[in-house]
């Protein structure tokens, strides 16, 4: 987790006086609790928005945007906690919007935004709003969270972000597996214009079950400049197994800006539909 | 421009099953996570089920989980509800909502403002 360009946060707005500052996700009024506290945000919305860094790349961004409630505990309102954690990491980053002048009411509804977070592709992450100073022990929560999931490198937009591109996401393999005889598949695939090596990685399943009854991997050596943007075909020798006839296959690239981390592309080729076999009807018909 | 419209309501009885549909046009579709929100007669809004551009996420409120499913076609620019063993207190007015950006929130949009409603279809459950 991380800020795009650290740079240039601002959160000042016509009659607030506002800095954005880093946190320790730890306010001060946890521990020094005080009497008097603001009321919850006000619908929290979270978009995702693209943004360009100086160099000129392209990262997802979280967009968050709340509203203030109109009550009189906006007087005592010194700022802001934004939270932000990724769920399968348990990573957090917070940075804090401190209020330098006092809020007052005017004719329209408070609205805050910060876009600086960045998120990775087909990550979720609770985004926590939190009013300043935090609420005393059992006092109302002034706090507003939502859950939100990032769409992955297979999504048109994202395909076209910097961290997609880097693990591959351009590359189109339009991989195609046909059944030969003899037990084998012929795969092909197209290759990209990268002179790096690729794994086939074949599993196999018995129909309707998802243990594999056969695995192999087979090592594509890197093309030469010539052969990019062309048909790989690579023939599989099938294990002889009766009922194992579900096939996946998995191509694993290695290219320079993921390595092993690269996203991997599959086709699965199902079971050929057993014919109902009606019962044979005999030629003649028995007297008892 | 951009519409919703839900169709597939109806009067029905406790136990029986209903599947609504909602058609999408005016925008980029598979771009968009989607839900289902409903709001009883004289209550407030309360969402049902979510599904991401791919249907690779879906989630359902409590109330709903194990009756309900949700699905959608890409190619036909169509989100469907599945509703199984349906009570009575599923009578409603069912709308169909998309979300404002490309991202997904669990436990409804991810903005309190929803960017575009169809008209609703009105599920009534009675005996």
């Known amino acids: 987790l991380r800020l795009l360009d650290h740079r240039a946060l601002v959160c000042s707005q016509p009659g607030l006086n506002c800095t954005v500052k880093n946190s320790t996700c730890l306010d001060d009024s946890w521990i020094h609790p005080r009497n008097l506290t603001p009321s919850s945000p006000k619908d929290l919305q979270i978009q995702l928005h693209f943004a360009h860094t100086q160099q000129g790349d392209l990262f997802p961004v979280a967009h968050i945007e709340w509203t203030l409630q109109t009550d009189a505990s906006i007087l005592y309102l010194e700022g802001a906690e934004l939270s932000v954690l990724q769920l399968n990491t348990n990573e957090r980053l917070c940075v804090r919007f401190e209020f330098l002048s006092k809020l007052r009411h005017h004719h329209r509804r408070w609205r805050f935004t910060f876009s600086h977070f960045v998120v990775d592709p087909d990550q979720e992450y609770e985004v926590t709003v939190h009013h300043l100073p935090k609420p005393i022990p059992d006092g109302d929560p002034n706090h507003q969270s939502k859950n939100f999931l990032v769409p992955d490198c297979e999504h048109a937009r994202m395909k076209v972000t910097t961290p997609c591109m880097s693990s591959g996401s351009l590359w189109d393999p339009n991989i195609t597996v046909e059944t030969l005889e003899a037990h084998q598949l012929r795969v092909s695939f197209t290759l990209w214009n990268e002179s790096t090596h690729y794994q086939i990685l074949l599993t196999s399943f018995p129909h309707m079950e998802n243990h594999s009854c056969f695995e192999h991997m087979h090592h594509i050596p890197a093309p030469r400049p010539e052969e990019f943007h062309q048909r790989s075909n690579v023939t599989l020798t099938l294990r002889n197994l009766k009922g194992c006839c579900r096939h996946q296959v998995q191509i694993q690239p290695f290219f320079s800006s993921c390595l092993n981390d690269c996203l991997r592309h599959s086709a699965t080729v199902s079971c050929p539909e057993m014919p109902d076999t009606p019962e044979p009807i005999p030629d003649y018909m028995p007297l008892w | 421009q951009v519409q919703l419209v839900e169709s597939g309501g109806g009067l029905v009885q406790p136990g029986r099953s209903l599947r609504l549909s909602c058609a999408a046009s005016?925008?980029?579709?598979?771009?968009?996570?989607m839900h289902w929100v409903r709001q009883a007669p004289g209550k407030g809004l309360e969402w049902v089920s979510g599904?991401?551009?791919?249907?690779?996420?879906?989630d359902y409120a409590d109330s709903v989980k194990g009756r309900f499913t949700i699905s959608r076609d890409n190619a036909k620019n169509s989100l469907y509800l599945q509703m199984n063993s349906l009570r009575t207190e599923d009578t409603a007015l069912y709308y169909c909502?998309?979300?404002?950006?490309?991202?997904?929130?669990?436990?409804?949009?991810?903005?309190?403002?929803?960017?575009?409603w169809g008209q609703g279809t009105m599920v009534t459950v009675s005996s």
């Open positions: 599904i991401t551009w791919n249907s690779g996420r879906i």
């Open positions: 909502v998309k979300e404002r950006s490309l991202g997904y929130c669990r436990g409804g949009p991810c903005s309190d403002a929803f960017d575009i």
């Open positions: 005016g925008f980029t579709f598979d771009d968009y996570a």
